[in-house]
């Protein structure tokens, strides 16, 4: 008789989740010499230990502490790029501008990027059928708590000028409920971070509006400046040209506004 299983509203654990995490870990540590000391089997065991046999609506940041410890990594604190609702362009940018880092350019971010996972209370099984949805089921689910934990630590590590890429095509360019708006903004340390520079990425080719005037950007500005951090905003009118100019800064067309 099949055992009753909790039906959650979100998609289940990504297929071949353990193998994917392990393979990503091996690949990352091969590419990044500073992380070669990492034992990927221990990383997987710590990752698994954070959610296996636990109720998937009752996960805490403490559950991830062993994994955080194993994945401790130093990135240049003044080369951090945060993003909100525009992950692909942010990743394309750091692939070209190799001295800048998104969270997904770190080991822990790389391991979990685009994956879903959850377990079941009192069983060692991984749930491949469904996992809790943040809105419909619960916020303290394994995936949300993981990203909240790593995002908080990433923001806390930042210093000097921190950049954030924001999607100018969204109705809320800055969304207080996004990971950036709810976690990272509040965990930038004013003692270390002097300036947050927002890059607002335009979607339409003919869009010449100053999206730095958007009410949600002014809301971000207010939150940031009240925390003793300066705020700078720049429109990126042509993201394609922007990337091209990052690749070839000497190009004569790259002196004009992008």
């Amino acid at each position: 008789v099949p055992r009753w299983r909790q039906q959650w509203s979100g998609p289940g654990t990504t297929k071949r989740f353990p193998e994917t995490v392990l393979a990503r870990c091996v690949k990352y540590t091969e590419i990044h010499p500073e992380m070669r000391h990492v034992d990927c089997q221990s990383v997987w065991d710590a990752f698994k230990g954070a959610f296996i046999s636990k109720h998937p609506c009752n996960i805490t940041e403490e559950d991830y502490q062993p994994l955080m410890k194993l994945g401790t990594q130093t990135v240049p604190c003044n080369k951090i790029l945060l993003w909100s609702r525009i992950k692909d362009l942010a990743h394309q940018f750091t692939q070209v501008q190799r001295d800048m880092f998104t969270l997904e350019d770190t080991l822990l971010g790389y391991l979990a990027d685009d994956l879903t996972w959850c377990g079941e209370f009192n069983t060692s099984k991984i749930n491949y059928q469904s996992c809790p949805d943040w809105r419909k089921d619960c916020s303290n689910n394994p995936v949300s708590v993981f990203w909240k934990t790593v995002s908080r630590r990433f923001a806390e590590a930042a210093c000097d000028v921190v950049h954030v890429m924001l999607n100018g095509s969204r109705s809320k360019i800055f969304d207080k409920n996004s990971t950036f708006g709810s976690v990272e903004v509040h965990n930038l340390q004013p003692e270390k971070v002097q300036t947050l520079e927002a890059w607002v990425i335009h979607g339409g080719r003919e869009d010449s509006r100053d999206l730095c005037q958007d009410p949600t950007i002014k809301e971000l500005e207010s939150i940031i400046s009240k925390r003793n951090i300066q705020f700078s905003c720049k429109n990126i009118y042509r993201p394609d040209k922007f990337l091209q100019c990052v690749k070839n800064p000497e190009d004569s067309s790259c002196t004009s506004e992008i």
Epitope: C212, E221, Q230
Partner: antibody
Framework: QVQLVESGGGVVQPGRSLRLSCAAS????????VHWVRQAPGKGLEWVAV???????DYNAAFMSRFTISKDNSKNTVYLQMNSLRAEDTAVYYC?????????????WGQGTLVTVSS | DIQMTQSPSSLSASVGDRVTITCKAS??????LAWYQQKPGKAPKLLIS???SLETGVPSRFSGSGSGKDYTFTISSLQPEDVATYYC?????????FGPGTKLEIK
């Protein structure tokens, strides 16, 4: 290019009021904060107030009760209303642009306008 | 308010000399320090922000260093056009306050 031009200075009696203007060009007040800084004759610099691009203001508490900063975005002009003036308010008053959107350092300054409070 | 002190209050040096000015805050200002140059009868000019970042167009002979409460401004090789008064400014907390200035002259 960025330019700031102050006006409205002059000789005024103690207890009277004066309104200084700062006409900005080469940038928009919708994009940058503008500060007032003063310098008494032969003395150092003293930060007075700032008006941010959204219209909110911060003041040096020493001036908050007597001075008011405001702006007219359509004229791209910032104002400093100074009431109940005292002899010790005699100074050159500079307006200056925030280096970045909400910046606390000042990258462009006007030439200053001299305010003399004397009976 | 955060008090800023500068030393020396004035100094005289020869062309080509290395000149150092110090600025001390009454509390930790976490590198939120700017340096300005003011020539006689002129408005101040921003040289350095964030304790160490040289503004665009400012000659590389100017530099800034320091952390916590203590900061230093250096001119590696003094030029005649550097005659001016130099001010530090903290931008950690409002009211943003300036040092009293250091008047630099050529011997």
């Amino acid at each position: 290019q960025v330019q700031l031009v102050e006006s409205g200075g002059g000789v005024v009696q103690p207890g009277r009021s004066l309104r200084l203007s700062c006409a900005a060009s080469g940038f928009s007040l919708l994009s940058y904060g503008v500060h007032w800084v003063r310098q008494a004759p032969g003395k150092g610099l003293e930060w007075v107030a700032v008006i941010w691009r959204g219209g909110s203001a911060d003041y040096n508490a020493a001036f908050m009760s007597r001075f008011t900063i405001s702006k007219d975005n359509s004229k791209n002009t910032v104002y400093l209303q100074m009431n109940s003036l005292r002899a010790e308010d005699t100074a050159v008053y500079y307006c200056a642009k925030s280096m970045i959107t909400t910046g606390f350092t000042l990258d462009y300054w006007g030439q200053g306008t001299l305010v003399t409070v004397s009976s | 308010d955060i008090q800023m002190t500068q030393s020396p209050s004035s100094l005289s040096a020869s062309v080509g000399d290395r000149v150092t000015i110090t600025c001390k805050a009454s509390e930790d200002i976490y590198n939120r320090l700017a340096w300005y140059q003011q020539k006689p009868g002129k408005a101040p000019k921003l040289l350095i922000s964030g304790a160490t970042s040289l503004e665009t167009g400012v000659p590389s002979r100017f530099s800034g260093s320091g952390s916590g409460k203590d900061y230093t401004f250096t001119i590696s090789s003094l030029q005649p056009e550097d005659v001016a008064t130099y001010y530090c400014q903290q931008f950690w907390n409002t009211p943003w306050t300036f040092g009293p200035g250091t008047k630099l002259e050529i011997k």
